[in-house]
Interface confidence: low
């Protein structure tokens, strides 16, 4: 009795770049690394039935279900999905294994269900069952982490109420500025919820799940640092927890820290202090001000004072709803073909925004950078000197913001011509928008200098292609010019371009392009 062929079932996730219905394929597209689906023999089943692990797929994701058969000789196969037979073309890989693939492009609800694969080898017949379902990401959430004090301990707990359960990590850094970027050796990440070492320069907590990654920085006033030119500002929504850390280093322990809100000392239970000696035997003290759930009356200037350092303040503003403050008036820019240029939007927002830049229905990633004055900035430089309309869109839990930009690239006109039995038309996309002249070429005017003014109709910006204006000029046919060559010329401050058209009987028209700078 011959051994059963060895079956391997794999799932391949693809980067989406196509759209189609599920199809059987002998050569699946280039992809991510395969995931083994197990393919165990189904107990108590008549015949040889293998069952793959259930497959959950995101809407619009593309996958390949693939079976590798370590069977001697040729194999034939058939896919069945929702009682319909689908074509199946096995091929053999370099290890001489039979490979059968089912590609599902752009997953939809209709493509979810049971996929049955029947394989016939020289030795055995067997069935493989795949169950494909759509992952319910509608229930998924990713909330910004917040801090809580750990009961009876000098430690902070980082909490993110997200679905699925997020991985929470602390991101710690003891350097200043640029060296605290994520990839720097100065950055330490701790994949745990509780943090005891609260003396670092920069402390953030991040939560990540299938939807991405959200981080919250522990707002800190450092009395040993020169204060910012503008007062640091912290926004919170009603009901959110407030945490501010005041930090100070001194040569010895003979100093104390206090918090005041609008010149009144914070109540007991709204602060706690920690201290430690640093490696050079100086004393580090930190004093936390915290409110477990803020109300409107927690708004104001929070001042940290020390007996040995100048005091520093932060303005805490409690808002009912999140906001995005920026000027939404549209902006037009005119640049040369090789000029370096970036669009930029300066905004103040709470909570932090998610944003995109869009051009020609294509979205681009959006980076934002915090400025010292409480504002943030997002720049977009990847326009590749393509003229048109660019859109910046930002949103947070409570607000949305859209700003339009128009980019014009200064260049001399390029002319395209069309002709019909009754008229000739010329189009140009140069910028600034060109002006037009029509000239007749005749025996009297072999250089085409005889200007035509009758029957000319100019339309400026008659067609908008993703914000790119196109100018056109149309010449209506008259007996006086039928059968002649005419020349349309578009000119602007950067040059002139012309096209010559033969106005004869209807049919295809030859065009001769002239470029005149």
């Amino acid at each position: 009795n011959q051994d059963l062929p060895v079956i391997k079932c794999v799932l391949i996730n693809h980067k989406n770049n196509d759209s189609s219905v599920g199809k059987s394929s002998s050569y699946p597209m280039v992809s991510e690394s395969p995931e083994d689906l197990g393919c165990a023999l189904r107990p108590q089943s008549s015949g040889t039935v293998y069952e793959a692990a259930a497959v959950e797929v995101d809407v619009s994701a593309s996958i390949t279900l693939q079976v590798l058969v370590d069977a001697p000789g040729n194999i034939s196969c058939l896919w069945v999905f929702k009682h319909s037979s689908l074509n199946c073309q096995p091929h053999f890989d370099l290890q001489n294994r039979g490979v059968v693939s089912m590609v599902i492009l752009k997953m939809t609800e209709t493509q979810a269900g049971e996929y049955l694969l029947f394989i016939q080898s020289e030795a055995t017949n067997y069935t493989i069952l795949f169950t494909v379902s759509i992952r319910n990401t509608l229930l998924y959430t990713l909330r910004r982490p917040y801090f809580r004090k750990m009961e009876n301990q000098d430690a902070l707990v980082c909490i993110s109420e997200s679905v699925p359960e997020p991985i929470v990590e602390w991101v710690l850094c003891d350097s200043q500025g640029e060296s605290c970027k994520e990839e720097s050796p100065a950055v330490v990440k701790k994949e745990e919820k509780v943090l005891h070492e609260l003396f670092g320069t920069d402390i953030r907590c991040c939560a990540r799940n299938e939807l991405g990654r959200e981080c919250t920085r522990l707002f800190t006033i450092d009395l040993n640092q020169t204060p910012q030119t503008t007062l640091p500002q912290l926004f919170l929504k009603v009901g959110e927890p407030l945490w501010i850390r005041c930090k100070a280093v001194h040569v010895n322990h003979g100093f104390g820290l206090t918090w005041e809100l609008e010149n009144k000392a914070l109540e007991e239970g709204n602060y706690f202090e920690m201290s430690t000696y640093s490696t050079n035997r100086t004393m580090i003290r930190i004093l936390f001000a915290f409110v477990s759930s803020v109300a409107r009356n927690d708004t104001g200037y929070y001042t940290c004072s020390s007996s040995k350092h100048p005091s520093q303040s932060a303005l805490v503003t409690i808002v009912e709803k999140g906001f995005i403050n920026a000027t939404n008036s549209s902006e037009d820019y005119e640049i040369d073909q090789y000029e370096e240029f970036c669009f930029s939007v300066r905004f103040k927002a709470y909570p932090q925004i998610r944003c995109t830049w869009t051009f020609s229905r294509k979205s681009f990633p959006c980076e934002q950078k915090g400025l010292d004055n409480g504002y943030s900035i997002s720049k977009f430089c990847n326009h590749k000197h393509q003229p048109g309309e660019y859109i910046f869109h930002a949103e947070n839990d409570d607000a949305q913001f859209t700003k339009m930009f128009t980019l014009n690239i200064r260049r001399k006109p390029q002319v395209l011509a069309e002709a019909s039995a009754s008229q000739a038309s010329c189009f140009s996309d140069g910028y600034p928008l060109p002006s037009w002249t029509w000239k007749k070429c005749s025996d009297k005017s072999p250089n085409c200098t005889e200007e035509i003014t009758e029957g000319v109709w100019n339309r400026k910006a008659n067609r908008k292609v993703f914000g790119q204006w196109v100018s056109s000029s149309t010449l209506n046919m008259s007996e006086a010019i039928k059968g002649f060559l005419v020349k349309c010329c578009a000119y602007n401050s950067l040059g002139t371009s012309c096209e010559t058209i033969l106005l004869n009987s209807p049919g295809p028209f030859p065009f001769i392009q002239d470029n005149i700078s």
Partner: antibody, heavy 120, light 107 residues
Framework: QVQLVQSGAEVKKPGASVKVSCKAS????????MHWVRQAPGQGLEWMGR????????SYAQSFQGRVTMTRDTSTSTVYMELSSLRSEDTAVYYC?????????????WGQGTLVTVSS | DIQMTQSPSSLSASVGDRVTITCRAS??????LGWYQQKPGKAPKLLIY???SLQSGVPSRFSGSGSGTDFTLTISSLQPEDFATYYC?????????FGQGTKVEIK
């Protein structure tokens, strides 16, 4: 200051195992990955694997899979690297090395190295 | 595995020379690259991390550049203490492979 102190030189016979220790001090032991890198005489550096001292999870280079085991003892801030089924080509200096951050990155501190000689 | 190819494998230079060592990755590693200096009988020492960031305490004559697959370590004016072997290492994905090394010798 940060220090990684490794155990002394070892001479082993082919087929035997060796266990090298690396004691860390001067920083929070569980906050940094510990990598192991070896260097055969006159040769370049070869990455062997890493351990996360916080949770104990490991990742090994394919060429050492099945022969290397990395462990840690948080009570003594020490990591261990055990290499089994030794062959003469395993003669090398073995370094433990500290890497900030959970996702790799550059090695900012190295141990002094432990010479392991495999000879019959 | 990602292969790291360093060139040249050795070079001779004089004090004051500008020296450039290149490192090429077999696939895109963004800027996840470190440069190390090793002297005989000693452990390597980190010079550059994240392709271009200078490790604290390292002289500013050392600089790194590049991203993606091509990277460069430059020593603007070679000093007597710089004669050593230099290695690049990618930390983009496990295993974190090293280049084969470039030995900088006195001319």
């Amino acid at each position: 200051q940060v220090q990684l102190v490794q155990s002394g030189a070892e001479v082993k016979k082919p087929g035997a195992s060796v266990k090298v220790s690396c004691k860390a001090s001067g920083y929070t032991f569980t906050s940094y990955y510990m990598h192991w890198v070896r260097q055969a005489p006159g040769q370049g550096l070869e990455w062997m694997g890493r351990i996360n001292p916080s949770g104990g999870s490991t990742s090994y280079a394919q060429s050492f899979q099945g022969r290397v085991t990395m462990t840690r003892d948080t009570s003594t801030s020490t990591v261990y690297m055990e290499l089994s089924s030794l062959r003469s080509e395993d003669t090398a200096v073995y370094y433990c090395a500290r890497v900030p951050g959970l996702y790799g990155g550059a090695i900012d501190y190295w141990g002094q190295g432990t010479l392991v000689t495999v000879s019959s | 595995d990602i292969q790291m190819t360093q060139s040249p494998s050795s070079l001779s230079a004089s004090v004051g020379d500008r020296v450039t060592i290149t490192c090429r990755a077999s696939q895109d590693i963004r800027n996840d690259l470190g440069w190390y200096q090793q002297k005989p009988g000693k452990a390597p020492k980190l010079l550059i991390y994240a392709a271009s960031s200078l490790q604290s305490g390292v002289p500013s004559r050392f600089s790194g550049s590049g991203s993606g697959t091509d990277f460069t370590l430059t020593i603007s004016s070679l000093q007597p203490e710089d004669f050593a072997t230099y290695y690049c290492q990618q930390s983009y994905s496990s295993p974190f492979t090293f280049g084969q090394g470039t030995k900088v010798e006195i001319k």
